[in-house]
């Protein structure tokens, strides 16, 4: 009986530790995509609807804030698309990019952790164009550090929750 009690206590402890593991999956807020043809910061994301969830991390002012020190896996998926029903592209040569940036408040600094993308020729003769970027990496993050996303040509973003999103989850403590 004692062994059983110990075992279930261990399970509970494991489970509560897992439940306390920070994670976030944020999806684009399609009603508030900024305009611009150069690099802009995406500040409007959902954290509590559809596929979007957050636990033991904070989303504020368009940035994902780390609450616990640790090693985190960060990822971002950005889809760009254009269909001729919305009009024509003013230029057919495009640089479609995403930048995942870490900002530190304690020591004011900003670093690009990951970037991805390509230059594209989207011919006006085609009805539909699509391009997807996925970046991911393992980073040591400290409490208070902020993660943000910048993209080029936001007017071409695919606004679906399965297309444009980013997130993080803690993998282990810092020894």
């Amino acid at each position: 009986e004692k062994a059983m009690v110990d075992g279930s206590w261990l399970d509970l402890a494991k489970r509560s530790k897992l439940e306390a593991q920070p994670f976030a999956h944020l999806t684009i807020n399609a009603t508030d995509i900024p305009s611009g043809s150069h690099k802009v910061s995406l500040s409007s994301w959902y954290h509590d609807r559809g596929w979007a969830k957050i636990s033991n991390m904070t989303f504020s002012n368009g940035k994902l804030i780390v609450n616990q020190d640790g090693f985190y896996y960060l990822y971002a998926n950005i889809c760009f698309r254009h269909h001729e029903t919305s009009g024509d592209l003013a230029t057919e040569y495009l640089q479609l990019m995403v930048y995942v940036t870490k900002t530190s408040i304690k020591i004011p600094s900003s670093h690009t952790l990951m970037k991805g993308g390509s230059t594209k020729y989207w011919s006006g003769n085609s009805e539909f164009h699509f391009y997807s970027i996925n970046v991911g990496g393992f980073f040591k993050l400290r409490s208070g550090e902020e993660i943000s996303i910048e993209v080029s040509n936001p007017s071409l973003l695919d606004p679906d929750q399965d297309a444009t999103y980013f997130g993080a989850f803690k993998v282990r403590d810092i020894d």
Partner: antibody, heavy 126, light 103 residues
Framework: QVQLVQSGAEVRKPGASVKVSCKAS????????IHWVRQAPGQRLEWMGW????????KFSQKFQGRITVTRDTAASTAYMELRSLRSEDTAVYYC???????????????????WGQGTLVTVSS | EIVMTQSPSSLSASVGDRVTITCRAS??????LNWYQLKPGKAPRLLIY???SLQSGVPSRFSGSGSGAEFTLTISSLQPEDIATYYC?????FGQGTKVEIK
């Protein structure tokens, strides 16, 4: 206020060319596209082509490809449309119109024509 | 190539009447539809863009609705100055026009 002022009426013989100008004022000319649209007597409006005033990129209707040239002079805030090898069915009122999309804010030419010129009547007759 | 079809091609109504013009696209165009007013000898005027957004300076008696392939322009109370031809438009394609007259 935004204004597009076009050149005056023209009469041409079949086979000739015509060049219509469209002078813009009241906004930053380079930040918008200019479209050319025409209306022949008793016909619907017909889109001919556009020019991105910022970079000079153009797109034309297949119907006019090879006969039309659209240019711009950013210093003079003026767009020009030249139509060659004129025939009688090119008799129409030709309009320039500004696309509502600001190219600084995005790169999609949306085909909302928010300001129009007063129109230029081109008559093709022998 | 998308084709825009308007109906009716002309109509006659009294001042104060509610007038409705329909525009159909040959395939779905989401909400990318605009309406213009043309008066002889005058520059065309954008009334409605994006199917239902009223262009700045246009009287509120004009309204637009619809999505997909079927759209309507409504004049809630026809005024004498509304005598004109109205065109729907999606990108490069225009409807054939609806001429509105006063009875």
């Amino acid at each position: 206020q935004v204004q597009l002022v076009q050149s005056g009426a023209e009469v041409r013989k079949p086979g000739a060319s015509v060049k219509v100008s469209c002078k813009a004022s009241g906004y930053d000319f380079s930040n918008y596209a200019i479209h050319w649209v025409r209306q022949a007597p008793g016909q619907r409006l017909e889109w001919m082509g556009w020019i991105n005033a910022g970079n000079g990129n153009t797109k034309f209707s297949q119907k006019f490809q090879g006969r039309i040239t659209v240019t711009r002079d950013t210093a003079a805030s003026t767009a020009y449309m030249e139509l060659r090898s004129l025939r009688s069915e090119d008799t129409a009122v030709y309009y320039c119109a500004r696309d509502h999309s600001n190219m600084v804010r995005g790169i999609i030419i949306a085909y909302y024509f928010d300001y129009w010129g007063q129109g230029t009547l081109v008559t093709v007759s022998s | 190539e998308i084709v825009m079809t308007q109906s009716p091609s002309s109509l006659s109504a009294s001042v104060g009447d509610r007038v409705t013009i329909t525009c159909r696209a040959s395939q779905s165009i989401s909400r990318y539809l605009n309406w213009y007013q043309l008066k002889p000898g005058k520059a065309p005027r954008l009334l409605i863009y994006g199917a239902s957004s009223l262009q700045s300076g246009v009287p509120s008696r004009f309204s637009g609705s619809g999505s997909g392939a079927e759209f309507t322009l409504t004049i809630s109370s026809l005024q004498p100055e509304d005598i004109a031809t109205y065109y729907c438009q999606h990108t490069r394609a225009f409807g054939q026009g609806t001429k509105v007259e006063i009875k």
